[in-house]
Interface confidence: low
């Protein structure tokens, strides 16, 4: 039907309803105007990566599939003006860096998603006029630094943010008019933005509020985009961000509830309305959950994806639904529930994974489920659960564990226990083996029936298991991922901690020197290491090598009289740094270099006089610092801090001063900058070396003379570690 | 933004105590300072103390010093405020309050009203 | 405790009207003052601080001068939303204290 010459192929006007196959793999430029093509799928351009012009315009498209374009790396020039296109799928041009021209006008678009042009940085020409456009997310233009020209004229937008058209510096074409603009003080931006501007823009009028109607928004004053108090007082002073809403083809949206059920769907719908609070996907054939899939539903309370044929799960498949109550997951192939799957999903009460494939569960699998109710794995492949998976549901009531193939030997005695005392598993889970215990329940076996043969320790080592592991360590106590080695006179850390540890309890013990073992490079999961309550005084440089995960340290109560930053080499995640009650007197300007990620540092109890300037200026995402409990001396040297806690106006607790007596114990952050001062000998900055002498002194180990030099006033820079202090023969009349 | 919700109007007996909650909602407010202010009818505004909920510690103004305990659950993001040995002039409206520093008060819960009546 | 003294404390005004409601510290509190602004029934708004900063959302229309012991709170051009009780208060010292609060009603 088409025609082709040399590397243009012509298949406008044949009254096509999809996109022939066949194309020829060199083919440049693409001819399919004029047809009646509904749909374009992700195989339609499959291999045409030579493709440079494809035109799609005036034909009956409303549905783009996602990766429909991937494989058009040289695609320049696309037109899909005159179609029914209502969705504007986000990364469509992912793939296609080169395109410069771009035409979707006389379409029916209602909105912009933020991620629409991702990809397609080099375009020059956008054409979305004549759409039915009333948003535009932010920043979906932001990577289209090149535009020159965009036509948005005809649409129904009401607002846009400055953001979306401040980094466009070749625009030299620019419509806008033939909108519903709303002049309110969101939009008094434009009016600037337009003045800036002459030649772009003509013709942007005002359609409301009423008093400004017609009127040119360049001519407005800034003055009279006005907001109502109660918008106003509003604590975003933004416009109000819209959001891409629409409820996808063949499913039915109402009351803030989307009915996909039976729809054939092959994958989450992208771009639903991000109030809605419950998705129905059930009886559909979706795969895969890819990561984020609901992240913007922040409102989502309920969400049915039963009946599928999901097998594989992203980590953060649920990431962000704190609010979700129910869970339903039965009636699919899922083997194993990735690390971290229901992490945050504090708000669930029902989850539903019964009739899967599961063959194992991580023993943190559920931690964050403190409200769940109900929990089903009925009729699975569970041989073994670890002892701890189940106890941070404080809230269960309900658990339905038959119809797995358990073996109950020494690894599962903890469950019958765990039954016996809480009589939640109403299914009456049994037995497979061993031979003599098989069909029995597992609530009604006495516990010491649960045996293993041979010495195998208190791990599962079934192959079915997620993580074949290290035995626990002597003198340590392992529980779920949390090993317990606090209380036993430790002074270094033990060998063979297991892999999967996420807790590393070391607290209490007689550590005096952290050592730089490499201990942590075998612990991938750990996230947190309580040191506290140890006589630490050293921590070795690349003591914390290989801790790139762990986010939270504790190191209360040690001995630490100096922190340095390459004691904390390594700890790139870090968040939480507890120092509290050492014996740290200075920290100094390079102290916590490299700790970019942490948000609470404590160092509340200590002897701290001085920081030395900037020493908190790495920590980009500190938000709280404890700095109470210690003597700081506002001389000249703390000038900074005082400043700085005012500007940065981060949670500190309002540290204060001890020195000099006419600022004891005023707030640092409170005091005059012009009454740090080093007047009258304050001049002490104890991240100065220690062991100067003053010039008119002399010194002999901490032995420090200054007999008869005629002195008014107490030399500066005594050492700190001063024993003897000879003062005799000069002429104070004050006690320094 | 944080949004403070406060529990519901009270009645007491003088000599008894009250358990004012204000729970956060929009946010999580562990690291930031969370305030109870009164107001007695037709009065004037009066801070009665503070805490923030991760250093655990409450700061209180030493008119209220062993009447009012103020505690905070991280958990449930809700602080609390007791105020024990109830007086009719403690009759008022009790406001708890976050913000940026101890003692600025960005955002402000509905308020309880407390009324102490024989 | 540092105390706070506001006046008047009331005042009739017409909307247009450029109102000022000033506050005193009893002792130097640098330009630590924040204004509240409190409809009856209704919890205070934080509406300034640091003696001069708008809070995000404030109409423009108010203001804030002031160091030391003397502070001003300013509105260019009374609006209807605006009649309401202002509240002075000091962040440089534990207790916080609030001055008594100016009553601005409609003349």
């Known amino acids: 039907q088409c025609s082709c010459s040399g590397s243009t192929v012509d298949c406008h006007g044949l009254a096509l309803r999809i996109v022939p196959r066949n194309i020829p793999r060199n083919t440049e430029r693409l001819d399919l105007n004029g047809n009646n093509i509904t749909r374009i799928t992700k195989t339609d351009f499959a291999g045409l990566r030579h493709l440079r012009i494809l035109q799609l315009m005036e034909n009956k498209i409303s549905t783009i599939e996602r990766g429909a374009f991937h494989d058009l790396k040289e695609l320049e020039r696309l037109r899909l003006n005159r179609n029914n296109l209502q969705l504007f799928p986000e990364l469509l041009f992912l793939g296609t860096a080169k395109l410069y021209r771009l035409d979707l006008s006389e379409n029916q678009i209602q909105a912009i998603p933020r991620k629409a042009f991702r990809g397609a940085v080099d375009i020059k020409n956008l054409q979305l006029d004549y759409n039915q456009i009333s948003c535009i997310e932010d920043g979906a233009f932001r990577a289209l630094r090149d535009l020159e020209v965009l036509t948005l004229n005809n649409n129904n937008i009401t607002r846009l943010s400055v953001a979306s058209f401040n980094h466009m510096p070749k625009l030299r074409t620019f419509r806008l008019h033939s909108n519903n603009l709303y002049c309110d003080c969101h939009l008094a931006w434009l009016s600037d933005w337009l003045r800036q501007r002459p030649r772009v823009g003509l013709y942007t009028q005002c359609m409301g509020p009423s008093h400004l109607r017609g009127h040119n928004v360049a001519e407005v004053q800034k003055r009279e985009f006005v907001c109502s108090d109660e918008e106003e007082g509003h604590q975003s002073f933004m416009a109000p961000s819209c959001s891409v809403l629409h409820c996808p083809i063949a499913c039915t949206c109402s009351n803030n509830i989307v009915d996909c059920r039976g729809k054939g769907l092959t994958e989450i719908p992208t771009n639903l309305p991000e109030t809605i609070t419950e998705i129905r996907l059930e009886q559909n054939s979706i795969r895969v959950i890819p990561p984020g899939a609901f992240s913007p539903y922040k409102k989502l309370r309920r969400l049915d994806l039963s009946n599928n044929q999901i097998s594989e799960l992203a980590p953060d498949a649920f990431q962000g639904l704190r609010s979700l109550n129910s869970l339903v997951l039965y009636g699919n192939k899922i083997t194993e529930l990735p690390k971290s799957l229901f992490e945050g999903l504090f708000s669930l009460q029902l989850l539903l994974l019964n009739a899967n494939k599961i063959n194992c569960l991580r023993v943190d699998a559920f931690q964050d489920l403190h409200n769940l109710n109900l929990l089903s794995l009925y009729d699975n492949k569970l041989q073994t659960v670890a002892k701890g998976t189940f106890s941070a549901l404080r809230a269960i009531q309900t658990m339905h564990l038959a119809q797995n193939p358990f073996i109950c030997d020494c690894h599962l005695k903890w469950l019958a226990d765990y039954l016996h005392t809480n009589p939640i598993e109403t299914s009456g889970a049994r037995c497979t083996s061993p031979r003599r215990l098989a069909n029995k329940r597992i609530g009604q076996i006495k516990s010491k029936k649960f045996r293993c043969s041979g010495t195998e320790d208190y791990r599962s080592k079934l192959s079915g298991d997620c993580f074949a592991d290290l035995a626990c360590p002597e003198k340590c106590r392992c529980e779920g991922t949390t090993v317990d080695c606090s209380n036993q006179k430790l002074n270094k850390i033990p060998d063979h901690i297991p892999q999967y540890t996420a807790e590393l309890r070391l607290n209490n013990n007689e550590f005096t020197v952290l050592e730089a073992t490499g201990i942590f490079k075998k612990l991938p999961q750990l996230r947190k290491i309580n040191l506290s309550n140890n006589k630490i005084t050293d921590i070795e440089e690349g003591a914390f090598e290989g801790a790139s995960g762990v986010n939270e340290i504790l190191l209360t109560s040690n001995r630490l009289e100096n922190v340095q930053h390459k004691m904390f080499k390594g700890l790139e995640s870090l968040k939480t740094l507890m120092l509290r009650s050492n014996r740290i007197s200075c920290v100094g300007n390079d102290s916590f270099t490299g700790l970019g990620s942490v948000r609470l540092l404590s160092l509340y109890d200590n002897q701290i006089t001085t920081v030395a300037p900037g020493a908190f200026g790495t920590l980009h995402s500190l938000s709280t610092l404890n700095l109470l409990a210690n003597p700081f001396n506002c001389n000249c040297h703390l000038a900074w801090l005082g400043e700085w806690l005012r500007r940065k106006r981060i949670v500190t607790g309002n540290p204060r001063c001890q020195k000099p007596y006419f600022l004891k114990e005023i707030p640092i952050q409170d005091v005059a900058i012009q009454d740090f001062t080093c007047d009258d000998g304050n001049d002490d900055n104890s991240c100065s070396p220690l062991s100067r002498c003053p010039s008119e002194c002399t010194c002999l180990d901490t032995v420090v003379r200054c007999s008869n030099k005629g002195l008014k006033v107490l030399p500066k820079g005594i050492p700190r570690d001063v024993t003897e202090l000879y003062l005799d023969g000069n002429q104070f009349t004050l006690v320094p | 933004q944080v949004q403070l919700v406060q529990s519901g109007a009270e009645v007491k007996q003088p000599g008894s105590s009250v358990k004012v909650s204000c729970k956060a909602s929009?946010?999580?407010?562990?690291?930031?300072?969370v305030s109870w202010v009164r107001q007695a009818p037709g009065q004037g505004l009066e801070w009665m103390g503070g805490i923030i909920p991760i250093f655990g510690t409450a700061n209180y103004a030493q008119k209220f010093q062993g009447r009012v305990t103020i505690t905070a659950d991280e958990s449930t993001d809700t602080v609390y405020m007791d105020l024990s040995s109830l007086k009719s002039e403690d009759t008022a409206v009790y406001y708890c309050a976050t913000g940026s520093g101890w003692y600025t008060f960005d955002y402000w819960g509905q308020g309880t009203l407390v009324t102490v009546s024989s | 405790d540092i105390q706070m003294t506001q006046s008047p404390s009331s005042l009739s005004a017409s909307i247009g009207d450029r109102v000022t409601i000033t506050c005193r510290a009893s002792?130097?509190?640098?330009?630590?003052l924040n204004w509240y602004q409190q409809k009856p029934g209704k919890a205070p708004k934080f509406l300034i601080y640091?003696?001069?900063n708008l809070q995000s959302g404030v109409p423009s229309r108010f203001s804030g001068s002031g160091s030391g012991t003397d502070f001003t709170l300013t509105i260019s051009s009374l609006q209807p939303e605006d009649f309401a009780i202002y509240y002075c208060?000091?962040?440089?010292?534990?207790?916080?204290?609030f001055g008594g609060g100016t009553t601005v009603e409609i003349k």
């Open positions: 640091a003696a001069s």
């Open positions: 002792q130097n509190i640098n330009a630590y």
């Open positions: 929009g946010g999580s407010f562990r690291s930031y300072t």
């Open positions: 208060q000091q962040s440089y010292r534990s207790p916080p204290t």
